[in-house]
Each structure stands twice: as structure tokens, then as C-alpha cells.
């Protein structure tokens, strides 16, 4: 496999990870796919320090992160354990609100204008943040 030793152009390095901050919006799944095609994932927040870093870069704008409960329990896209991990929900969130009239509840997490988290309809076109780790072997698959 190959290792990424420095961040791509237009990405920001922080604590051995690279971050890319969108300036336009996409639905959660489309943002996730964008990150994956860039060998990254939607940002996974593992500490208060990382929360503050991301919050500083996105400003007071709704922004998708790599956390969802589309299949039941809340899960981080990179497999980081949700139950024991860092959380920064707004009071009374997540609430899986059905009152928006768009069908279904709310299955995708985003940073709100104050940085705290809310669950919302995954189809909303919010900005997003991609993250990829430095020094992580990419484990290229064998050719068939």
C-alpha cells in the first residue's frame, strides 16, 4: 500500500489529519461519496480540541459530519465507537424529529451555527468537511 505523508493541495493539516472544507452544499450521502472518491471520509470528531478546530474553520454554518443513524444506532463513518466517543449535541438533540414534513425522521448529524450538533434530514444540502489521516497505509486492493 501507499502512505500519505502530506496533505493534498487546498486541504488543511491538523494533528496528523487532513481536512477539506466545502463552500457549497450537498445532501449527506453525496457529500460522503465526494469524500470517499477523494480517499477521505466525512469528518469524525473525536475530541473537544478537534471540535474547536473544525468549528473555527466552518464558522456559523450548518455543516455535515460523518455521523448518522440511517441503519438504527448512531455510527461514525470510520467505525469510531459512538457510545464511548466524544459528543457535542445541542440540548434535547438528537430528537429524530418528524415534524419537518419531508417524510421520515432525522438521521444525519451536522454542526449547527454555534458548533453544537443536531440531527437533520439527510437530503438537506449542507456544507461538509472531509477528513483523511496522514501516515495511514491506504491498503490498495489486489488486482483481479
Amino acid at each position: 500500500g501507499s502512505e500519505r505523508t502530506c496533505c493534498p493541495v487546498n486541504w488543511v493539516e491538523h494533528e496528523r489529519s487532513c481536512y477539506w472544507f466545502s463552500r457549497s452544499g450537498k445532501a449527506w450521502a453525496d457529500a460522503d461519496n465526494y469524500c470517499r472518491l477523494e480517499d477521505a471520509h466525512l469528518v469524525v470528531v473525536t475530541s473537544w480540541e478537534e471540535q474547536k478546530f473544525v468549528q473555527h474553520h466552518i464558522g456559523p454554518v450548518n455543516t455535515w459530519m460523518g455521523l448518522h443513524d440511517q441503519n438504527g444506532p448512531w455510527k461514525w463513518v470510520d467505525g469510531t465507537d459512538y457510545e464511548t466517543g466524544f459528543k457535542n449535541w445541542r440540548p434535547e438533540q438528537p430528537d429524530d424529529w418528524y415534524g419537518h414534513g419531508l417524510g421520515g425522521g432525522e438521521d444525519c448529524a451536522h454542526f449547527t451555527d454555534d458548533g453544537r450538533w443536531n440531527d437533520d434530514v439527510c437530503q438537506r444540502p449542507y456544507r461538509w468537511v472531509c477528513e483523511t489521516e496522514l501516515d495511514k497505509a491506504s491498503q490498495e486492493p489486489p488486482l483481479l
Partner: antibody
Framework: EVQLLESGGGLVQPGGSLRLSCAAS????????MTWVRQAPGKGLEWVSA????????FYADSVKGRFTISRDNSENTLYLQMNSLRAEDTAVYYC??????????????WGQGTLVTVSS | DIQMTQSPSSVSASVGDRVTITCRAS??????LAWFQQKPGKAPKLLIY???SLQNGVPSRFSGSGSGTDFTLTISSLQPEDFATYYC?????????FGPGTKVDIK
């Protein structure tokens, strides 16, 4: 100068297999996502598949899912499309293209010259 | 999947004419739209990305506009080398679908 050169096309019977190659030069291949697009004779363009720079993540059109496999060899600067269980409707010119991430999406530029795949008995 | 439509399907024009091609998406794609030019027997060439950004090396007579569901490609003064087929493509979500194409030929 970026160059993409497809090969491996030809005549194959329905149900048969074929592997297309796309040799890349003029850019750091491993750092770019790549894609395949096809065009049936006299018809429009159809996106087929895409793959991330490392080869870890791949995406497919429903019409080819489960039959086609995209892969890449970054040591050889080559993109592949393994096509199995071929059907008459897979007959097309197959183009590879570099997928450049700009402004929050992926844009296909440049493209190779294409290789013709004909599925017929 | 997002459906893309184009109009007209063909247009006959003369050198120096202003030509406008429209593309419509079946749902909101923001500005995630590209325009390609294809000549017979050749590969497509990217002209415009992100709805209005001109690709490097593409003449300034080409311009793109629009957002949401309705988009336009304009050739301000048609040149002999511009007779070709033009395709729009959405890159909002997989699958990245193309429009059916608009053929620009000589009147």
C-alpha cells in the same frame, strides 16, 4: 501533457468477458480519482464507474453493478475495467477520464481516445 | 437517479451566430453541472465546470450560467470549429448522468 490511452476492446460474445486498460501519463496518477464513461454507437454518453486514487473506494452505475469491476495499479499508472457477463447493450466506445476534484465535485478532464467494445454472437 | 434533458436536440446556425443551449435537471443540483463538446470520432472535451467556470484553454466565447435545475451554455459568436455535439452532465450525485446532447450544425 496528460495522456490517457485505452486498450483491450474488441468483439466478444454475449456472456463473455473482457478487460479494458487505460494507461496514464503526464500526471501523478495515484493522487487522482479516475472514471469510465461509455457511448453506444450513435448515442449519448453514459457514466459507468469511478474509483478513488488509492483504489479503495469505487462506484458503479446500476446498469453494470455486479458485472463490471473497476480497479487500478498505481505502480503501473494503469486503470482497468473488468467486464463480465457482457450483453448486447454493453456495446459502446469506452472512455477513461481523469476525475479532478474542484469546487466540491469531480470533473472529467481529460479523456482518452476510447476503445470499442462490441458484444455480438 | 437525476434525469438531464437538453433543448433543442439540434440547432442549425451560421458562423458568427449566438447559440444558446439549455439543460434541465429533474431535481436541484445547485451548480454541480459540466458542459462537454464532442466532435465525430473524438472524445468529449470539458468546456465548463461548476455551471459557469471556464476550463483552461477554452475560448471565452463559451459561457455557462444557471443553478438549481436550469442551466445554459452560450456560444457568443459561433466559429467553424464549434460545430459539434454538446452535452451537459450533473455531478451532484452518483450516477453522474449526462443530457442526451445537442447537435450544432451548419445552416
Amino acid at each position: 501533457e496528460v495522456q490517457l490511452l485505452e486498450s483491450g476492446g474488441g468483439l466478444v460474445q454475449p456472456g463473455g468477458s473482457l478487460r479494458l486498460s487505460c494507461a496514464a501519463s503526464g500526471f501523478t496518477f495515484r493522487t487522482y480519482a479516475m472514471t469510465w464513461v461509455r457511448q453506444a454507437p450513435g448515442k449519448g454518453l453514459e457514466w459507468v464507474s469511478a474509483i478513488s486514487g488509492s483504489g479503495v473506494n469505487s462506484f458503479y452505475a446500476d446498469s453494470v453493478k455486479g458485472r463490471f469491476t473497476i480497479s487500478r495499479d498505481n505502480s503501473e499508472n494503469t486503470l482497468y475495467l473488468q467486464m463480465n457477463s457482457l450483453r448486447a447493450e454493453d456495446t459502446a466506445v469506452y472512455y477513461c477520464a481523469k476525475a479532478r476534484a474542484v469546487a466540491g465535485s469531480h470533473w472529467f478532464d481529460p479523456w482518452g481516445q476510447g476503445t470499442l467494445v462490441t458484444v455480438s454472437s | 437517479d437525476i434525469q438531464m434533458t437538453q433543448s433543442p436536440s439540434s440547432v442549425s446556425a451560421s458562423v458568427g451566430d449566438r447559440v444558446t443551449i439549455t439543460c434541465r435537471a429533474s431535481q436541484d443540483i445547485s451548480s454541480w453541472l459540466a458542459w462537454f463538446q464532442q466532435k465525430p470520432g473524438k472524445a468529449p472535451k470539458l468546456l465548463i465546470y461548476a455551471a459557469s467556470s471556464l476550463q483552461n484553454g477554452v475560448p471565452s466565447r463559451f459561457s455557462g450560467s444557471g443553478s438549481g435545475t436550469d442551466f445554459t451554455l452560450t456560444i457568443s459568436s459561433l466559429q467553424p470549429e464549434d460545430f459539434a455535439t454538446y452535452y451537459c452532465q450533473q455531478t451532484n450525485s452518483f450516477p453522474f448522468t449526462f443530457g442526451p446532447g445537442t447537435k450544432v450544425d451548419i445552416k
